[in-house]
């Protein structure tokens, strides 16, 4: 019996087609992805093949103005239109709190939404009961397939799930659900979830009875053969893991942003064992036409977005200096504003010992593309912020050793004075440079804001300590020459859309007046 698994993950509000780098589509003839194009390909496969499942491994939420405006209603609407068979909850599904998940998505989705390792407690338990499930048994042709869901146990540090959801260890939570499915005579089981490729592989290895793992969170691109676009494969598709009980378990992921549709064909024997698996992600490029009816629906929903981008978010009573003359040479108040917003967006009271789990932010000055003039009545709009942060990136959470941070700050000024983008703006960090010293030895003082303290204060950076830092995904991926971050990071979790982080902060503060306050000094 043959099953076709179509899968997406980390779509992050890319409802419209995008450029090849998943930013806003500029030249339509070279654009990719989007739900209208995805639907065309899905329908084509559904017509051609008998047993097809369309699955999403989480993080539909967060990433473009679509989410900022529609807050998840767009996800439910278009996933319903595409007739998804199941979705696993990702960490970003909790970005607007549990209510922001329940109302727009859980209550509106016509497909099961899954996570076996999220347990509700207290008053939320009855409110959310039945709205998401640990597993779902799906009819596929004349057979049945069990889908078990899972979500990153780090979600409380990455999003806003509140205090009434407990995120258990994925493997511990999945095993009893898989066992139950087997006891109920379900012999074909897919683990669908959002914990990253390393955890996906562990699930394949450790959870007895799981036949296939469909993952997300780490934006992993797998491909067999010559890849069709810019993404470099992290391994073959499917990636085969040998389980502890000796089975070959295919593990797949489909990069991110709706650029690819994962396509996996699995052959099962009559006892539900995987005999063979093969496939590849399908690049959703312009050779695949956009479905006209879905496209028309997208255009209808778009109207509200255009209106939103010119509405006032808040006011500034000072000039927001985002000029390259400032932000690539010295501390600039636009950099301070953005870093403050980044930290504010990551406030998660961990426990009594920590005022927060993260206190530091770094931001490449070259990523700040425009100032905002306060003389326009102080008004700040989404449109203004899109000029400051035009790349559609995310502000991510990483864990780095102090020694890596020190290297990053040395890199920040290794060729100072040439108006290059690697000069770092900061938050929760006090750095002093001596430019008279040779490159690679210019950081003379580097103090960082404590997290394990009741009154935050600055302490010298410790080389062997592990620190959490918020930074643009561009830097996490080694951009602007920050190869040491990419090579040495100990953990990387993708965060919220950059503009959304700053816009939310401005809306919250209502009136802003960021200053230059001595975060970066030259001796």
């Amino acid at each position: 019996w043959e099953l076709t698994i179509l899968h997406t993950n980390d779509v992050h509000s890319r409802l419209e087609q995008t450029s090849e780098d998943s930013s806003k589509c500029v030249n339509a003839s070279r654009c990719m992805g989007g739900v209208a194009r995805l639907f065309t390909k899905v329908q084509q496969i559904r017509r051609a093949e008998p047993n097809v499942l369309l699955l999403d491994a989480g993080d539909q939420y967060q990433g473009t103005i679509w989410f900022t405006v529609y807050k998840g209603a767009e996800v439910a609407h278009f996933m319903n239109a595409l007739r998804y068979d199941a979705m696993a909850l990702g960490n970003h599904e909790f970005d607007n709190g549990v209510e922001g998940l329940i109302e727009p998505l859980l209550k509106e989705a016509k497909f099961p939404i899954l996570s076996a390792n999220i347990k509700a407690k207290g008053p939320l338990a009855s409110q959310i009961s039945g709205l998401y499930l640990p597993y779902k048994v799906l009819p596929v042709g004349d057979e049945v397939v069990g889908i078990v869901g899972y979500t990153s146990k780090e979600t409380p540090f990455l999003s806003n799930p509140g205090t009434n959801l407990v995120f258990e260890d994925e493997i511990t939570a999945l095993q009893p659900e898989v066992d139950k499915l087997k006891t109920l005579n379900v012999n074909k089981i897919i683990a669908l979830g959002h914990s990253g490729f390393e955890t996906d592989k562990l699930i394949a290895q450790k959870v007895r009875g799981v036949d296939v793992v469909v993952g997300g969170h780490s934006n992993t691109f797998l491909y067999t053969g010559n890849p069709p676009s810019k993404e470099v494969p992290a391994g073959k598709y499917p990636f085969i893991v040998t389980s502890d009980d000796g089975r070959k378990v295919p593990v797949v992921q489909a990069y991110a942003f709706g650029k690819y549709l994962g396509y996996l064909k699995i052959e099962f024997d009559e006892r539900g064992n995987v005999i063979s698996s093969h496939g590849n992600p399908i690049l959703l490029n312009s050779s695949i036409p956009e479905d006209p009816s879905i496209k028309a629906d997208i255009n209808k929903w778009r109207i509200k977005l255009d209106n939103y981008s010119t509405q006032e978010l808040g006011k500034t009573i000072v000039y927001l200096d985002g000029s390259s003359q400032s932000c690539r040479f010295r501390e600039c108040n636009m950099g301070n504003l953005i870093c403050d917003a980044m930290i504010n967006n990551n406030l998660r009271h961990a426990d009594e010992m920590f005022w927060n789990h993260v206190s530091m932010c770094i931001l490449n000055g070259g990523g700040i593309r425009s100032p905002i003039d306060e003389r326009n009545n102080g008004t700040i709009t989404w449109e203004n912020l899109a000029a400051v942060l035009p790349f559609g990136g995310t502000f991510d959470l990483v864990q780095l050793k102090g020694s890596t941070l020190k290297k990053a700050f040395e890199h920040s000024v290794h060729r100072y004075g040439q108006s290059t983008g690697e000069f770092l703006q900061v938050g929760g960090i006090h750095v002093v440079y001596d430019l008279s010293r040779k490159p690679g030895d210019r950081v003379v003082k580097l103090d960082v804001l404590c997290t394990k303290c009741r009154v935050p204060s600055y302490d010298p950076l410790k080389m062997d300590e592990i620190y959490k830092v918020i930074l643009p995904n561009f830097l996490a991926n080694g951009g602007d020459g920050f190869q040491m971050i990419k090579d040495e990071l100990l953990r990387h979790d993708s965060g919220d859309q950059d503009i959304n982080v700053v816009s939310t902060y401005i809306s919250k503060m209502k009136v802003i007046y960021p200053a230059v306050e001595g975060r970066i000094k030259f001796s």
């Epitope: 338990a125 009961s129 039945g130 048994v137 799906l138 009819p139 049945v144 009893p176 066992d179 139950k180 087997k182 006891t183 109920l184 005579n185 379900v186 012999n187 007895r208 009875g209 006892r271």
Partner: antibody, heavy 125, light 110 residues
Framework: QVQLVQSGGGVVQPGRSLRLSCAAS????????MHWVRQAPGKGLEWVAV????????YYADSVKGRFTISRDNSKNSLFLQMNSLRDDDTATYYC??????????????????WGQGTLVTVSS | QSVLTQPPSASGTPGQRVTISCSGS????????VSWYQHLPGTAPQLLIY???HRPSGVPDRFSGSKSGTSASLAISGLQSEDEADYYC???????????FGTGTKVTVL
Amino acid sequence: QVQLVQSGGGVVQPGRSLRLSCAASGFTFSSYGMHWVRQAPGKGLEWVAVISYDGSIKYYADSVKGRFTISRDNSKNSLFLQMNSLRDDDTATYYCARGHLLRIGDIFYYSLDVWGQGTLVTVSS
Amino acid sequence: QSVLTQPPSASGTPGQRVTISCSGSSSNIGSNTVSWYQHLPGTAPQLLIYTNNHRPSGVPDRFSGSKSGTSASLAISGLQSEDEADYYCAAWDDSLSGYVFGTGTKVTVL
């Protein structure tokens, strides 16, 4: 036709062992989870144990955990219940039953749809 | 002891409607389907009905079932003398990792 035929009941002293068998016919035995259920005299039905279609997963009621072992031989279409350290309160009629996941539309219902005829186990000194 | 609670007895005259309740929790009835079994003395129990009114072939449509939240019920309309038996509700229980039966209800036809 679909049938479960039980054997192996009888009278046994407390602390001793007994093995019940259940022979299946008329269906693909290796595709179904199988259960044991009992009814003590004058009492209601009590679920005892279940084994998955491939024998890899077994669950037991707390009252028999550590004393009873459910097993199966798919090549012989047979289900077994090994009962050790028997007690007076294990006296009951024991039934084997087939676990069935029924699909109606897109919804699945789980039930015990086929039962053996029952076999009486009497634990008495 | 059973985690699904039923009334010990119910009765009615021929032609009447009798309803049997079955109360459970979120770990059994709340998250799993419910079945009803008829047990006549000296015979093996027989599957009578699935949740939401689905009957195996051969079971008369006088028997109907329903479920709401953590409770279920079985209704027998047009009671007949051959309906005199013990009735049990049952469901999988996620907390116990096992199948659980109700306490049982003896239906008497007056």
